[in-house]
């Protein structure tokens, strides 16, 4: 969470940004809020990126002004125009790329004053893992797969029954580069598993952490997955 202040005459205006992460190959959002101003025509929003000449996006007098936009952002950016009056200056970024990572500045000018705040935007790839029982193996095994990760994550297994156990000796993890030569498919196999136990496959890099749980009993297989972004907020 980054809060910036500005002074215009006697007035401070608070601008707040949140460190956020973009999943490459999807649309992303760079979050920025400010003190609302009902006078839409008096609001100017400028997004800048460190090391880039020209603007990422500009919104003023109630509409986009892309005349100063840098070409790497052409056709890719939007503010949520209907939410500007309530203080939302967040930027939507189409088809996030690895090169979109960096430090951005959200600059706001309203009738109440000026302000700005920086935002660290991380880009990478993260996806939910899926765990299945690997019946092909000679012994009962679990196979944890996640289609897209970058940077290369760490993979760890855990068990509800054997809490604190180290499964590195009985698991094998591989990383296969995907066709676009950036992201990788993560596959981890855990050997010698026992039934009536819950196992967790945890995949983590500096952007996200994903966990897949599986419980195998005689009668059923229960699965659950979750994904959380790290260092946001």
């Amino acid at each position: 969470l980054i809060i910036g202040f500005g002074i215009s005459g006697k007035h401070f205006i608070t601008v707040t940004t949140f460190t956020s992460a973009g999943n490459i190959g999807e649309d992303g959002t760079l979050s920025c809020t400010f003190e609302p101003d009902i006078k839409l025509n008096g609001i100017v929003i400028q997004w800048l990126k460190e090391g880039i000449k020209g603007l990422v996006h500009e919104f003023k007098e109630g509409k986009d002004d892309l005349s100063q936009q840098h070409e790497m952002f052409r056709g890719r950016t939007a503010v949520f125009a209907d939410q500007v009056v309530v203080g939302n200056a967040s930027l939507r970024l189409k088809n996030v790329q690895l090169t979109d990572a960096g430090t951005y500045t959200c600059y706001i000018h309203t009738s109440k004053g000026k302000g700005n705040a920086n935002l660290e935007y991380k880009t990478g790839a993260f996806s939910m893992p899926e765990i299945n029982v690997d019946y092909n193996a000679s012994s009962e095994s679990l196979r944890c797969e996640a289609p897209r990760w970058f940077p290369q994550p760490t993979v760890a297994w855990a068990s509800q029954v054997d809490q604190g156990a180290n499964f590195s000796e009985v698991s094998n993890t591989s990383f296969e580069l995907n066709s676009e030569n950036v992201t990788m498919k993560v596959v981890s196999v855990l050997y010698n598993v026992t039934i009536n136990n819950t196992y967790s496959c945890m995949i983590e890099n500096d952007i996200a952490k994903a966990t897949g749980d599986i419980k195998v009993t005689d009668s059923e297989v229960k699965r659950r997955s979750q994904l959380e972004l790290l260092n946001s907020g």
Epitope: E26, L66, G75, A81
Partner: antibody, heavy 115, light 109 residues
């Protein structure tokens, strides 16, 4: 050269299924937003579906539940699986790459649904 | 869902004249996500303008785009014989989905 080539169209009976293919060359399908757009005879363009670089998919309401967009990264090919076909699905189907907009289009493949 | 309405439906002009095509959105559209396409009979559409005003690669400078919010315009400053075709505007929305206008047919007078 950047190119898209569709195939798989033809005459199909109502309720039938068809799989359209779109072979890409000169760029990587999995790095782009890839779309299917159709055009009924004498009508305008209608967006059908998109698959993001991440693999996430979206569909127009008119086809939701009846079509599936997918890709084979090893073949650099986009697909559209069409089921429960109706007469109103008769159209030329185009695949299109979206970078900053739909800048590369295939030549189209014709699907005719008729008994 | 955002609806794009193009006007006029048909525009009859002579070579050398100026053509002005309109695209109106039912709600505000980001300029970045507004594009224009040209389509000739029996051919696939061709991208002309993206980001409301940026010309695509290889597009002559007689084509220009402008507008923001809900009103966008495609202008062809001096019509050439090869410009007579159907023109579509298109937006990338927040659903996310894409929407095309119904098209404007530019015909020779």
């Amino acid at each position: 050269e950047v190119q898209l080539v569709e195939s798989g169209g033809g005459l199909i009976q109502p309720g039938g299924s068809l799989r359209l293919s779109c072979a890409a060359s000169g760029f990587t399908v999995s790095s782009n937003y890839m779309n299917w757009v159709r055009q009924a005879p004498g009508k305008g363009l209608e967006w059908v579906s998109v698959i993001y670089g991440s693999g996430r998919t979206y569909y127009a309401d008119s086809v939701k539940g009846r079509v599936t967009i997918s890709r084979d990264n090893s073949k650099n090919t986009l697909y559209l699986q069409m089921n429960s076909l109706r007469a109103e699905d008769t159209a030329v189907y185009y695949c299109a790459r979206d970078t900053y907009a739909m800048d590369v289009w295939g030549q189209g493949t014709t699907v005719t649904v008729s008994s | 869902e955002i609806v794009l309405t193009q006007s006029p439906g048909t525009l009859s002009l002579s070579p050398g004249e100026r053509a002005t095509l309109s695209c109106r959105a039912s709600q505000s559209v980001s300029s970045s996500y507004l594009a224009w396409y040209q389509q000739k009979p029996g051919q696939a559409p061709r991208l002309l303008i993206y980001g409301a005003s940026s010309r695509a690669t290889g597009i002559p400078d007689r084509f220009s785009g402008s507008g923001s919010g809900t009103d966008f315009t495609l202008t062809i400053s001096r019509l050439e014989p090869e410009d007579f075709a159907v023109y579509y505007c298109q937006q990338y929305g927040s659903s996310p989905m894409y929407t095309f206008g119904q098209g404007t047919k530019l015909e020779i007078k």
